[in-house]
C-alpha cells in the first residue's frame, strides 16, 4: 500500500460494500479459445479476433456487425472444429447449476449467411460439435439428434425421452450436480464417427416439490417437481450406448449398441462416473458402486465384424478405498497415450497422497510417476514426450498451484514451469493448452493481481503478457486494501492451514473483531493464494474486521489422512476444528475474543450452524446461508459418498446425531441469522424450515430471511445486493460497529 502505515494519516478511500456490490473494481480476464495448435480466438469489443500464438499478430475472425440484423441477443457462440460454421446461442433459459435450454442458429462462415433450412429446434437442451469437421449432436425433449451437415435434416438417435423420466444424452438432477458437473451426457469419439451417450431412468426417483411464486399477478403459486434422490432413497438407473453416426439414415432407426456395466456393478445400485475415448475405436468407462469406495474401469473396443463393443475382463481396473471414498469427488479421468494402450491417472498412493500413476491396459498394477507429501491437482496435457500437471508441491503450500512437466522417458526429470516466473505475485496457476500442447496460456490468480501470459512448450519460454491488470492496479493504489496472510498452525503434530484477510494498516498490538468464513466440506480448500475482491475485502477494508478461513480435518489436497478423517462422520471433526481454529486465533493477541463471528453458505452454513449449536462459548454470532440441517435431506450421491446409507445396518445413528435441529437449545447462547432461497433445488428450503421449527420449539430468538424464488446461489442482482447488505448489518450490529 502506498501512503503511511498510520491509518489515521491515510486519506485514501476504503473498499466499500457498494464497491463490492456494484463491482467497481473489475478484474480483467483473458478468456481465449484455442482453435488449433497455434491459433486462438479472443473477443475484443465484440469482434472475434484470431491470434497467432507464436507472433501475436491478429486478424478479425468475425466482425461485431455481422449479426446486427440477427434480431436476438447472442448469449454464446461456438465455432466448428473445421472453422466453417459458427453456432449461435440465444433465448438462454437457466435450469440448474449447469443445465439450460436455448435456441440455436448456424452461420456459414464461407457463404457469410445464416442457414435457414433444417434448423435446430427451440428449447434445445444441449448441442455439441463433433471434435473434427462439423457434425452436430443435440438433445431436444430428452432425445438425441445428429446432424451430419448443418443444412441437412437431423437423424433421431433415441425415441424414449420423457420429461423427468427418461433422459437421453443429458443428465438428471443428481448426475448433473454430483457426478458429471455438466448437463451433457454425450461423448463424441475423436474423429466424430461414434457418439456415445448415457440414458438415465428416473421412473422410481422420488420428487422434491416446492412452490414457485413468480409474478405478483400469479394467483396460485406454481409447484416445481424435480426427481431428486435424497440419501437412502431410490436412485436413477443408468444405461450406456454407442451409435455409429456413419450409419444413420432417414428410413431406418439408428442402432445404438449398449455397453453394460461390469458384473461387479450390476449386483447392486451403481453409477456411471466417467467416459473417456482412448482412440477412435476404444472407449473407457468408469463405474462406481453406490457405496462409493469401489470403482471399476472398463476398456471397450469396437469389433468391426460384429458392430459390437467388447470390454475384456482382463482389462478391467479396480480402484478402491479402505479409508474413505474413491477420488476427490469421483474417480479421476484417465489420460490415454496416442496408441490407447496405456494411460495416466491420479490415484491415492500408499501414503494417501494423490499422485499420477502409469497404467498399461492389460496390466493390473501401475507405476507412480510422482510422489511426495503433496498432491497432483490435475493432469493438464499429454504429449509423446511430456506429461504436464498442476500440483501444490512448491514450498509445501497446499494452497498454491503450479504447472510442472515430467519427462516420460525419465520420471526423475521434472521441471516446474511456473514456480519462478513471478514468485511474489504468482503462486496460484491454472493453464490452457493449445490443441496439441505446442503453446499454453498461464493464468495466475494470486496472491497479486491476476496475470495472463502466453508460453511456448518448445522451450517453455514466455512469449508475451496477455493481460496484467495494470489498470486495476493503478485504481487500487488509491484504495486502502486489506492484506492477506497465509500460514498454518500445528494441532496434534499436523499442519493445518488458514488464511486471514487483515484490515489495512493491520497492527498486531490492537484487537480486531474476527469473522470466520467457513465451508469445510470434504475436499474443500479455503486457505489459498488466490487474490479476490469480495465481501471479505469490504469487511476488512471498511469495517476493520479480520476475515479468516481454516482448512481442518476433511479438507482437501493434503492427503487422505486429513481428508478421510471425516469419513462416515460429517458434522464432527470439521466442525470441532473450526471451533479450535477460532480458539487458536484468539490466542494470537490481535483478536477481540468477545467479537468472534462465523458464517458460511451451503456446507458452510451447516458447519456454521453446528458450530453455533455446539455451546462452545467461542462465538458471539453467526450467519448460515442455505445450510444443510440433516443429511437425510440432501442428495444421495453426495451424502452417501461420505456417510454411507441411513439404515440401521449402516450409518443411521450418525445421520441422526449430526443434525442442526438436535442442537437447538444451544442457540440461546448466540445470535443467529438464518437465510435461504425458497426455490433452492439443491439444498431445499425444507432444511432451513426444519432449523427454524426446532429453534421456535425451544424458544430461541433468532433472525431469518428468505429470498423468494431464489435458488442455491441467491444470485439475482437484487437478491445478491440484498443478502450482502443484510448480512453486513447483522455483522456490524454483532460487533457493535457504527
Amino acid at each position: 500500500n502506498k501512503g503511511t502505515d498510520d491509518a489515521t494519516a491515510d486519506s485514501r478511500k476504503t473498499y466499500t460494500l457498494t464497491d463490492y456490490l456494484k463491482n467497481t473494481y473489475r478484474l480483467k480476464l483473458y478468456s481465449l479459445r484455442w482453435i488449433s495448435d497455434h491459433e486462438y480466438l479472443y473477443k475484443q469489443e465484440n469482434n472475434i479476433l484470431v491470434f497467432n500464438a507464436e507472433y501475436g499478430n491478429s486478424s478479425v475472425f468475425l466482425e461485431n456487425s455481422t449479426f446486427d440484423e440477427f434480431g436476438h441477443s447472442i448469449n454464446d457462440y461456438s465455432i466448428s472444429p473445421d472453422g466453417q460454421f459458427i453456432l449461435l446461442e440465444y433465448n438462454y433459459v437457466k435450469q440448474w447449476r449447469h443445465s439450460y435450454t436455448a435456441s440455436y442458429d448456424i452461420y456459414d462462415l464461407n457463404k457469410r449467411q445464416l442457414i435457414t433450412e433444417e434448423r435446430i429446434p427451440n428449447n434445445t437442451q444441449w448441442v455439441t460439435w463433433s471434435p473434427v469437421g462439423h457434425k452436430l449432436a443435440y438433445v431436444w425433449n430428452n432425445d438425441i439428434y445428429v446432424k451430419i451437415e448443418p443444412n441437412l435434416p437431423s437423424y433421431r438417435i433415441t425415441w424414449t425421452g420423457k420429461e423427468d423420466i427418461i433422459y437421453n444424452g443429458i443428465t438428471d438432477w443428481v448426475y448433473e450436480e454430483e457426478v458429471f458437473s455438466a448437463y451433457s451426457a454425450l461423448w463424441w469419439s475423436p474423429n466424430g464417427t461414434f457418439l456415445a451417450y448415457a440414458q438415465f431412468n428416473d421412473t422410481e426417483v422420488p420428487l422434491i416439490e416446492y412452490s414457485f411464486y413468480s409474478d405478483e399477478s400469479l394467483q396460485y403459486p406454481k409447484t416445481v417437481r424435480v426427481p431428486y434422490p435424497k440419501a437412502g432413497a431410490v436412485n436413477p438407473t443408468v444405461k450406456f450406448f454407442v451409435v455409429n453416426t456413419d450409419s444413420l439414415s432417414s428410413v431406418t432407426n439408428a442402432t445404438s449398441i449398449q455397453i453394460t456395466a461390469p458384473a461387479s456393478m450390476l449386483i447392486g445400485d451403481h453409477y456411471l462416473c466417467d467416459v473417456t475415448w482412448a482412440t477412435q475405436e476404444r472407449i473407457s468407462l468408469q463405474w462406481l458402486r453406490r457405496i462409493q469406495n469401489y470403482s471399476v474401469m472398463d476398456i471397450c473396443d469396437y469389433d468391426e465384424s460384429s458392430g459390437r463393443w467388447n470390454c475384456l475382463v482382463a482389462r478391467q481396473h479396480i480402484e478402491m478405498s479402505t479409508t474413505g471414498w474413491v477420488g476427490r469427488f469421483r474417480p479421476s479421468e484417465p489420460h490415454f497415450t496416442l496408441d490407447g494402450n496405456s494411460f495416466y491417472k491420479i490415484i491415492s498412493n500408499e501414503e494417501g497422497y494423490r499422485h499420477i500413476c502409469y497404467f498399461q491396459i492389460d496390466k493390473k498394477d501401475c507405476t507412480f510417476i510422482t510422489k511426495g507429501t503433496w498432491e497432483v491437482i490435475g493432469i493438464e496435457a499429454l504429449t509423446s514426450d511430456y506429461l504436464y500437471y498442476i500440483s501444490n508441491e512448491y514450498k509445501g503450500m497446499p494452497g498454491g498451484r503450479n504447472l510442472y512437466k515430467i519427462q516420460l522417458s525419465d520420471y526423475t526429470k521434472v521441471t516446474c514451469l511456473s514456480c519462478e516466473l513471478n514468485p511474489e505475485r504468482c503462486q496460484y496457476y491454472s493453464v490452457s493448452f493449445s490443441k496439441e500442447a505446442k503453446y499454453y496460456q498461464l493464468r495466475c490468480s494470486g496472491p497479486g493481481l491476476p496475470l495472463y501470459t502466453l508460453h511456448s512448450s518448445v522451450n517453455d519460454k514466455g512469449l508475451r503478457v496477455l493481460e496484467d491488470n495494470s489498470a486495476l492496479d493503478k485504481m487500487l493504489q488509491n484504495v486502502q486494501m486489506p492484506s492477506k496472510k497465509l500460514d498454518f498452525i500445528i494441532l496434534n503434530e499436523t499442519k493445518f492451514w488458514y488464511q486471514m484477510i487483515l484490515p489495512p494498516h493491520f497492527d498486531k498490538s490492537k484487537k480486531y473483531p474476527l469473522l470466520l468464513d467457513v465451508y469445510a466440506g470434504p475436499c474443500s480448500q479455503k486457505a489459498d493464494t488466490v487474490f479476490r475482491l469480495n465481501w471479505a475485502t469490504y469487511l476488512a477494508s471498511t469495517e476493520n474486521i479480520i476475515v479468516a478461513s481454516f482448512d481442518g480435518r476433511g479438507s482437501g489436497y493434503q492427503g487422505d489422512k486429513i481428508m478421510h478423517a471425516i469419513n462416515r462422520r460429517l458434522g464432527t471433526f470439521e466442525v470441532e476444528d473450526q471451533i479450535e481454529a477460532a480458539r487458536q486465533f484468539s490466542k494470537m493477541g490481535f483478536v477481540d475474543n468477545k467479537r468472534i463471528a462465523i458464517w458460511g453458505w451451503s456446507y458452510g452454513g451447516y458447519v456454521t450452524s453446528m458450530v453455533l449449536g455446539s455451546g462452545s462459548g467461542v462465538f458471539k454470532c453467526g450467519i448460515a446461508v442455505a445450510p444443510v440441517s440433516r443429511w437425510e435431506y440432501y442428495d444421495s450421491v453426495y451424502t452417501e459418498r461420505y456417510m454411507g446409507l441411513p439404515t440401521p445396518e449402516d450409518n443411521l445413528d450418525h445421520y441422526r446425531n449430526s443434525t442442526v435441529m438436535s442442537r437447538a437449545e444451544n442457540f440461546k447462547q448466540v445470535e443467529y441469522l438464518l437465510i435461504h432461497g425458497t426455490a433452492d433445488d439443491n439444498v431445499h428450503f425444507q432444511q432451513s424450515a426444519q432449523i427454524s421449527k426446532a429453534l421456535v420449539d425451544v424458544g430461541v430468538d433468532f433472525q431469518a430471511m428468505w429470498y423468494t424464488d431464489e435458488d442455491h446461489g441467491i444470485a439475482s442482482s437484487t437478491a445478491h445486493q440484498h443478502i450482502y447488505t443484510h448480512m453486513s448489518h447483522f455483522i456490524k450490529q454483532c460487533f457493535s460497529l457504527p
Epitope: 455409429n244 450409419s247 439414415s249 432417414s250 431406418t252 458392430g307
Partner: antibody, heavy 116, light 107 residues
C-alpha cells in the same frame, strides 16, 4: 479407398436361382447398408432392396417373395439371391453403399441374362 | 410408393449452354432427393445429395435446388463430358424410387 466389386452374373435359365456377390473394401458392412438396384436394358433404375449395417433387411414389395439379401461381415461381402428367375429379370444389377440418405459408391454392375 | 416424374426425357444443348432437368414427386419429400449421373456403359455416380449439396469431386457447374415436390438439377455450362443419363432418387421413404431418367446430349 472405398470399393464395391461385383461378381456372379451371367446367363440363367428361367426358374433358376441367381446369387450375386458384392465385396466391399475400405469400409465395414456393420456400419453401412448395402443396396441393390437393377437396370433393364435401355431402361431406368429400379430399387430391389437393402441390408442395413445391423443386419435388418428391406425389400421392394415387387421382389419380397423371391429375393433375399444377406451378408457375411467377416468376408465383407453382401449377397443378392433371387429365385424363380424370369425373362424380365434380365438386367444389370448394381450394389451400392448407403451413406445416410444417398448412394455414394456403386459397384461396377453385373449383367444377368435370363433366357431359355 | 412415391412416384418421381422426370422431365424432359431427353435434352440436347450446345456446349456452354445451361441445361435444366426437373423432378416432381407424387408427395412431399422435404429435401430428401438425390441426383445421379450415368455415362454410357458405366455405373451411376452421385452428383447431388439432399436436393442441393454437391458431392465431393463433382464440378461446381452442377447444382440442385427445390424442396417438397419440385426439384431441379442445373448444369450451368454444359460440357461434352456431361453427356449422360441423369436420375433423381428419393430417400425419404421405402421403397426408394428413381425418376425415369433424362438423357442429355450435345448438339
Amino acid at each position: 479407398e472405398v470399393q464395391l466389386v461385383q461378381s456372379g452374373g451371367g446367363v440363367k435359365q428361367p426358374g433358376e436361382t441367381l446369387r450375386l456377390t458384392c465385396t466391399a473394401s475400405g469400409f465395414s458392412l456393420t456400419t453401412y447398408g448395402v443396396h441393390w438396384v437393377r437396370q433393364a436394358p435401355g431402361k431406368g433404375l429400379e430399387w430391389v432392396g437393402v441390408i442395413w449395417g445391423d443386419g435388418r433387411t428391406d425389400y421392394d414389395a415387387a421382389f419380397m417373395s423371391r429375393v433375399t439379401i444377406s451378408k457375411d461381415t467377416s468376408k465383407s461381402t453382401a449377397y443378392l439371391q433371387m429365385n424363380s428367375l424370369r425373362a424380365e429379370d434380365t438386367a444389370v444389377y448394381y450394389c451400392m453403399r448407403n451413406r445416410h440418405d444417398w448412394f455414394d459408391y456403386w459397384g461396377q454392375g453385373t449383367t444377368v441374362t435370363v433366357s431359355s | 410408393d412415391i412416384l418421381l416424374t422426370q422431365s424432359p426425357s431427353s435434352l440436347s444443348a450446345t456446349p456452354g449452354e445451361r441445361a435444366t432437368i426437373t423432378c416432381r414427386a407424387s408427395q412431399g419429400i422435404r429435401n430428401n432427393l438425390n441426383w445421379y449421373q450415368q455415362k454410357p456403359g458405366q455405373a451411376p455416380r452421385l452428383l447431388i445429395y439432399y436436393s442441393s449439396n454437391l458431392q465431393s469431386g463433382v464440378p461446381s457447374r452442377f447444382s440442385g435446388s427445390g424442396s417438397g415436390t419440385d426439384f431441379t438439377l442445373t448444369i450451368s455450362r454444359l460440357q461434352p463430358e456431361d453427356v449422360a443419363a441423369y436420375y433423381c432418387q428419393q430417400s425419404i421413404k421405402l421403397p426408394f424410387t428413381f425418376g425415369s431418367g433424362t438423357k442429355v446430349e450435345i448438339k
